[in-house]
């Protein structure tokens, strides 16, 4: 059965300077491959976070993703700025061999509105 990626909130509002959580769960870790968060769509989308060990300032995972059965890939963005506004997508990839990883499923997106302090 095909993996499903669920982002339960269609939108969240956060005051500038505060933190917000973007929720994402998957129904399976198979086929193997990373899960990444992006802002925007298409060629111009921006990588926000990848669950592959790199450090991303202001962003951290919410659950303990080192649990081998973890299906929760929610993230917390701290010290939100107006530039963080946009629609965020949680995306499951299948690992590539010699080619790049292949996107196989995306969540429906969560729009982040940043309110003036």
């Amino acid at each position: 059965t095909e993996v499903k990626v669920t982002q339960p909130e269609k939108s969240v509002s956060v005051a500038a300077g505060d933190s917000t959580i973007l929720n994402c769960t998957v129904t399976s870790l198979l086929p193997v491959g990373p899960i990444r968060w992006y802002r925007g769509v298409g060629q111009s989308r921006l990588l926000i976070y990848s669950f592959t060990g790199e450090h991303f300032p202001r962003i951290r995972n919410v659950s303990d993703t080192t649990k081998r059965n973890n299906m929760d890939f929610s993230i917390r963005i701290s010290n939100v700025t107006p530039e963080d506004a946009g629609t965020y997508y949680c995306v499951k990839f299948q690992r590539g061999s010699s080619e790049p990883d292949t996107e196989i499923q995306s969540g429906g997106g969560t729009e982040v509105y940043v309110l003036a302090k």
Partner: antibody, heavy 118, light 107 residues
Framework: DVQLVESGGGVVRPGESLRLSCAAS????????MSWVRQAPGKGLEWLAG????????YYPASVKGRFTISRDNSKNTLYLQMNTLTAEDTAVYYC???????????WGLGTLVTVSS | ALTQPASVSANPGETVKIACSGG??????YGWYQQKAPGSALVTVI????KRPSDIPSRFSGSASGSTATLTITGVRAEDEAVYYC???????????FGAGTTLTVL
């Protein structure tokens, strides 16, 4: 620099218990899953146990489940392996290893030798 | 269980390939570990199929396709003589596994 230093090995008699320790430094220990791997004399590598970063979830192969217990103390940056009812087949060099995001290993300790002999 | 050849040999400067099979591409990731003497230190040369730690020379590379992972050493050197273990993690069983090791002899 990442450093993993095992200790607690030695000579024990069959049926006895032993607790190994692995002191970690040079990285945020509480953010990484960890594992124990052993190598019997003249043999290959055998994975023994894994533990999540927070310590709540543990994993074992059937060969040691119920006899070995992995644990960690994140306040002390230390990983442990409790080994009970040891037999001669447990004689090996025991390594601790740091896990990558997909549960492979990127850093290893130098190992500690456990000899089970009467 | 992962399967790899017991031994390979090469002259300095040649390219060496060590294959490791047995893992399902759908659920498996591979790594490669170097050990220069039995019971001595282990060094990760490849993780996540093809990722090389920053302190490992670029002559080491890895790939995975189907049920087989391959470690390639391009322009092998005398100091590369060691036992190379392939290892894997299976997302369907939450278990790690290793091959029996391949002894690389540089002639």
């Amino acid at each position: 620099d990442v450093q993993l230093v095992e200790s607690g090995g030695g000579v024990v008699r069959p049926g006895e218990s032993l607790r190994l320790s692995c002191a970690a430094s040079g990285f945020t220990f509480s953010s990484n899953a960890m594992s124990w791997v052993r190598q019997a004399p003249g043999k290959g590598l055998e994975w023994l146990a894994g533990i999540s970063a927070g310590g709540s979830d543990t994993y074992y192969p059937a060969s040691v489940k119920g006899r070995f217990t992995i644990s960690r103390d994140n306040s002390k940056n230390t990983l442990y392996l409790q080994m009970n009812t040891l037999t001669a087949e447990d004689t090996a060099v025991y390594y601790c290893a740091r896990e990558t995001w997909n549960h492979l290993f990127d850093y290893w300790g130098l190992g500690t030798l456990v000899t089970v002999s009467s | 269980a992962l399967t790899q050849p017991a031994s390979v040999s090469a002259n300095p400067g040649e390219t060496v390939k060590i294959a490791c099979s047995g893992g399902d591409y759908y659920s498996y990731y591979y790594g490669w570990y170097q050990q220069k003497a039995p019971g001595s230190a282990l060094v990760t040369v490849i993780y996540s199929d093809d990722k090389r730690p920053s302190d490992i020379p670029s002559r080491f590379s890895g790939s995975a396709s189907g049920s087989t992972a391959t470690l390639t050493i391009t322009g092998v050197r005398a100091e590369d003589e060691a036992v190379y273990y392939c290892g894997g993690y299976d997302y369907s069983t939450y278990a790690n596994a290793f091959g029996a090791g391949t002894t690389l002899t540089v002639l």
